[in-house]
């Protein structure tokens, strides 16, 4: 299925406009901002979601909290350029002709430059580390229960193949979820780890992208898991290129 036929909505992306104007009167949904048709049986790409978010009201939120670590998304929200497949274009520029190169999850990986800046290829983010801190609980969560629940969440809610959830680490109160997906591993139809991580991030913040689904009520064996801090680290297949002054 692509979109819910009965009331013509997109189950996996609420930031869409849907109408029964597809082939044979089928429900077809287009992303806000870009107008691109989306496949509602899977996650929408992060690039199209960011573009839709910029076109919607109340768009002053930052993407993830700033951190001093490399390849944490410090730049906040921007209106990205997406290619015809909905992926980030390797070079992004703002209205003042400031340009930079991004990786496959849209995070800046070079210093900012001008329109002469070249970004030869879209570098793939092959390893994502999601670092969560949960609110105090009576006791620690059982590690194997937590591991199973988070793996199930990524498989069933985000449709990410289990082989891409490399590990779940837990040292109370810190939970780390490692997602790994090389270019060679990702087959046609596989959900991208960057898209899954973005949906998860929005869910954690109480800003679910799913249509009409309850927000993410994270529980482990009935115990609520309330996240009070999220940091997401991105590792690219090719190291980023920043000048040394940025690192001081």
């Amino acid at each position: 299925h692509t979109a819910a036929q009965d009331n013509c909505t997109c189950p996996t992306n609420k930031m869409t406009v849907c109408s029964p104007d597809g082939p044979g009167g089928r429900c077809q949904c287009r992303a806000l901002g870009s107008g691109m048709a989306v496949d509602c049986s899977t996650l929408t790409s992060k690039c199209l979601l960011l573009k839709a978010r910029m076109s919607a009201p109340k768009n002053a939120r930052t993407l993830v909290r700033p951190s001093e670590h490399a390849l944490v998304d410090n730049d906040g929200l921007y209106d990205p350029d997406c290619d015809p497949e909905g992926r980030f274009k390797a070079r992004q520029c703002n209205q003042t002709s400031v340009c930079w190169c991004v990786n496959s999850v849209g995070v800046r990986r070079t210093d900012k430059g001008d329109l002469s800046l070249r970004c030869d290829e879209l570098v793939r983010t092959h390893h994502i580390l999601i670092d969560l801190r949960h609110r105090p609980t009576a006791g620690a969560f059982n590690h194997s229960d937590l591991d199973a629940e988070l793996r199930r969440l990524f498989r069933e809610r985000y449709r990410l193949h289990p082989k891409f959830v490399a590990a779940v680490h837990y040292e109370q109160p810190t939970i780390q979820i490692e997602l790994r997906q090389n270019t060679s591993q990702k087959a046609a139809g596989d959900v991208d780890i960057g898209d899954a991580a973005y949906y998860f991030e929005r869910d954690i913040k109480g800003e679910s992208l799913f249509q009409g689904r309850g927000g993410l009520d994270l529980r482990v064996r009935g115990e609520p898991l309330q996240v009070e801090r999220t940091l997401i680290y991105y590792l690219d297949e090719i190291p980023p290129k920043f000048s040394m002054k940025r690192l001081t």
């Epitope: 199973a148 199930r152 969440l153 069933e156 309850g214 009520d217 994270l218 529980r219």
Partner: antibody, heavy 123, light 107 residues
Framework: QVQLVQSGAEVKKPGASVKVSCKAS????????MHWVRQAPGQGLEWMGI????????VYAQKFQGRVTMTRDTSTSTVYMELSSLRSEDTAVYYC????????????????WGQGTLVTVSS | DIQMTQSPSSLSASVGDRVTITCRAS??????LNWYQQKPGKAPKLLIY???SLQSGVPSRFSGSGSGTDFTLTISSLQPEDFATYYC?????????FGQGTKLEIK
């Protein structure tokens, strides 16, 4: 101790609706999910849907989509299951069952069950 | 939907016997598999959750094993009160399907 007490048996005509209640006690009502499962005479168990009493989110089995509505009343710690457009094949015992739950709408196990409500659909 | 297939559908055994019931899922469900016991006219009762964890108050003669797609419920030494119908259920993803049941009868 945990208890789920369901409403009494019902006899309905085809095309009518039935609303079965399930009153919970002995635990924090909004801290667990509630499922509805039915069992036709001499048959196996059939899952109908799940409700999260803390936010009233629901997920229904495709078979019952459009005919079933699950609601809750937190003031009385009661969940309700309404089934419309009844037909003879809906004759069954309807059970509510508690679930400590994983992340919504993920189940863990149905650890406590109501006593069941027999709904008979007959003209 | 995930299909759950139990075998056998019925089984005759004697008090003191060791009995094994199997359940197969149509796709991997990790260890999200539960076993229930139901007696005529009564609601089902949870015996085993998460494939191998014994529910509180359930006698230790009941045990469960398995992961992925193949699961087993074992009763080590049948007691008279164990004659009932047993159901497996996957709690991995909606719809939370049950096996068709295994009726355990006295030989």
């Amino acid at each position: 101790q945990v208890q789920l007490v369901q409403s009494g048996a019902e006899v309905k005509k085809p095309g009518a609706s039935v609303k079965v209640s399930c009153k919970a006690s002995g635990y924090t009502f909004t801290g667990s999910y509630m499922h509805w499962v039915r069992q036709a005479p001499g048959q196996g168990l059939e899952w109908m849907g799940i409700i999260n009493p803390s936010g009233e989110s629901t997920v229904y089995a495709q078979k019952f989509q459009g005919r079933v509505t699950m609601t809750r009343d937190t003031s009385t710690s009661t969940v309700y299951m309404e089934l419309s457009s009844l037909r003879s094949e809906d004759t069954a015992v309807y059970y509510c069952a508690r679930d400590p739950g994983g992340s919504w709408p993920f189940s863990y196990a149905l650890d406590y069950w109501g006593q069941g409500t027999l709904v008979t659909v007959s003209s | 939907d995930i299909q759950m297939t139990q075998s056998p559908s019925s089984l005759s055994a004697s008090v003191g016997d060791r009995v094994t019931i199997t359940c197969r899922a149509s796709q991997s469900i990790s260890s999200y598999l539960n076993w229930y016991q139901q007696k005529p006219g009564k609601a089902p009762k949870l015996l085993i959750y998460a494939a191998s964890s014994l529910q509180s108050g359930v006698p230790s003669r009941f045990s469960g094993s398995g992961s992925g797609t193949d699961f087993t419920l074992t009763i080590s030494s049948l007691q008279p009160e164990d004659f009932a119908t047993y159901y497996c259920q996957q709690s991995y993803s909606t719809p939370y399907t049950f096996g068709q049941g295994t009726k355990l009868e006295i030989k």
